[in-house]
Interface confidence: low
């Protein structure tokens, strides 16, 4: 009679996790008695997965009717698979005897395990950072086998191309992590943007993962300032406004010097929201030309989201007629017009 | 049908570099690594290193390390496998080979870039 | 690294003969064993991986077998396209390898 063969006929086994996997074997002969084994890897560290003869194995269940002499079936199923019991399993015919020896191994079955990554955590920088600049945005996942993954990056729908992403561990492992790094260049127009990680993996059947940052947690949009008058029907009275434009976030306080001393503090509250997510914000100051007899400096300082002031300053005659006169004592960007919600803040001298 | 079209033949002064590409079609090009094997005239096949297209994680032979660089274009799903230095020795074709991930073997390849070294 | 020995490098066989050529792996590689025909001026072709598992659309007269060390491809029925160069390849672990080829040639 020819001598027994141990047969595994799956060279692998894919599962995923939280499934069974059942791993088969077959031998072509009874002969010789003796139980069969499974083991997890080989060699002297390998792992005794289930004993036919003795051993209790509550994960294990045997495919056949293992007690019965004429059996010949040694396939077993393993529940609730995790990435941890990813590796090569052996069947192993043993040999009667005390103790039992080692008689003939199966060619192996590697039984890998599908694990999902959890959803991709995308994390900003801790400060925020104004248009122009770049700014790096990290996204990671955990968890998941086998070890291949992609990972892209989208900023409102268009794919990002500066990232650097790495997969931990290099080596072999149960289950693995991805970290990516993406810089992304603000605009002024990013208050209503998104970035958006995307994790594509074999086990998510085409439907990748996606973690996203609003990049309005991120951008800072300086305001801009324009300071104007317009006469009121009184003669000593000139109303000058403070028009500040295209500002995020929300935050802003504004003063008012006259000649350099503080007339008036107020914090912005009901703003204007353009389409593009910015504020639009404007103050009034009714100044009495009578109560002046020289030329009156009158500055409009805006410090916005914790940031150093910036302001506009506009010449007031007293001695002619009132005409417009600017001059800037802060560099600003130039804010497109808007509607205005306007605040009528009366201030007599 | 799943295919591999590499570039054309290629002749290269000693010291230079070259850079063969590798155009796949027919098949999820992120699913698989692409190797690249080479065969000077009238001798065996030399494995090179792979590029696991999905990604990016790249293994080179020690004999090619620092000379051989591989890269991908998921979007193009194209492969590049660029030689720099390059002796009268390196004068042969260049094969890339689509491999799977668990047993690396080479199901599908390229038919092959011929690159001459000479001065 | 792991070496791979081929014999013979060449032999000569007539159609029909049954043809086998060996693969020695310098250590054990399990069944991580390829086996790739070429003909001159082509690429290879693969025929077997996983030491004995046959590639789609490759004829059944191909067979190969063994493990761990030790791995043979056997061609029963030489026919005239099988006229070929074969090559072994290990996939065990990097820097993969071939063997050195064995030359089929018509006696």
């Known amino acids: 009679e020819e001598e027994l063969q141990v047969i595994q006929p799956d060279k692998s086994v894919l599962v995923a996790a939280g499934e069974t996997a059942t791993l088969r074997c077959t031998a072509t002969s009874l002969i010789p008695v003796g139980p069969i084994q499974w083991f997890r890897g080989a060699g002297p560290a390998r792992e005794l997965i289930y004993n036919q003869k003795e051993g209790h194995f509550p994960r294990v269940t045997t495919v056949s009717e293992s007690t019965k002499r004429e059996n010949m079936d040694f396939s077993i199923s393993i529940s609730n698979i995790t990435p941890a019991d990813a590796g090569t399993y052996y069947c192993v015919k043993f040999r009667k005897g005390s103790p039992d020896t080692e008689f003939k191994s199966g060619a192996g079955t590697e039984l890998s395990v599908r694990a999902k990554p959890s959803a991709p955590v995308v994390s900003g920088p801790a400060a925020r950072a104004t248009p122009q600049h770049t700014v790096s945005f990290t996204c990671e996942s955990h968890g998941f086998s086998p070890r291949d993954i992609t990972l892209k990056w989208f900023k409102n729908g268009n794919e990002l191309s500066d990232f650097q992403t790495n997969v931990d561990p290099v080596g072999e492992s149960v289950s693995y992590s991805i970290h990516s790094t993406a810089k992304v260049v603000l605009t002024r127009e990013d208050v209503h943007s998104q970035v958006i990680c995307e994790v594509a993996h074999v086990t998510l059947q085409g439907d990748p993962l996606r973690g996203t940052a609003n990049l309005s947690e991120t951008i800072r949009v300086p305001p801009t300032l324009e300071v104007t008058q317009q006469p009121v029907r009184a003669e000593n009275q000139v109303n000058v406004t403070c028009q500040v434009r295209k500002f995020y976030p929300q935050r802003l306080q504004l003063t008012w010097l006259e000649n350099g001393n503080v007339s008036r503090t107020e914090t912005a509250s009901t703003v204007t929201e353009n389409k593009d997510g910015t504020y639009n914000w404007m103050s009034w100051l009714l100044v009495n030309v009578s109560a002046h007899r020289d030329d009156v400096k009158l500055t409009c300082q805006v410090e916005h989201d914790g940031q150093p002031a910036v302001s506009k300053s506009h010449d007031l005659k007293v001695s002619a007629h009132p005409k417009e006169q600017g001059s800037n004592t802060a560099a600003e960007n130039t804010g497109s017009n808007e509607r205005h919600h306007h605040h009528h803040h009366h201030h007599h001298h | 049908q799943v295919q591999l079209v590499q570039s054309g033949a290629e002749v290269k002064k000693p010291g230079a570099s070259v850079k063969v590409s590798c155009k796949a079609s027919g098949y999820t090009f992120t699913s698989n690594a692409m190797h690249w094997v080479r065969q000077v005239p009238g001798q065996g096949l030399e494995w090179m290193g792979w590029?696991?297209?999905?990604?990016?994680?790249?293994k080179y032979s020690q004999k090619f390390q620092g000379r051989v660089t591989i890269t991908r274009d998921t979007s193009a799903t194209t492969a590049y496998m660029e030689l720099s230095s390059l002796r009268s020795e390196d004068t042969a074709v260049y094969y890339c080979?689509?491999?799977?991930?668990?047993?690396?073997?080479?199901?599908?390849w390229g038919k092959g870039t011929t690159v001459t070294v000479s001065s | 690294d792991i070496q791979v020995t081929q014999s013979p490098s060449s032999l000569s066989a007539s159609v029909g003969d049954r043809v086998t050529i060996t693969c020695r792996a310098s250590q054990s590689i399990s069944d991580f064993l390829n086996w790739y025909q070429q003909k001159p001026g082509k690429a290879p072709k693969l025929l077997i991986h996983a030491a004995s598992s046959l590639q789609a659309g490759v004829p059944s007269r191909f067979s190969g077998s063994g493990s761990g060390t030790d791995f043979s491809l056997t061609i029963n029925s030489l026919q005239p396209e099988d006229f070929a160069t074969y090559y072994c390849?290990?996939?065990?672990?990097?820097?993969?390898?071939f063997g050195g080829g064995t030359k089929v040639e018509i006696k």
């Open positions: 390849q290990q996939s065990y672990s990097t820097p993969l390898s």
């Open positions: 080979a689509r491999g799977d991930y668990y047993y690396y073997y080479m199901d599908v």
């Open positions: 590029i696991k297209a999905g990604n990016a994680e790249i």
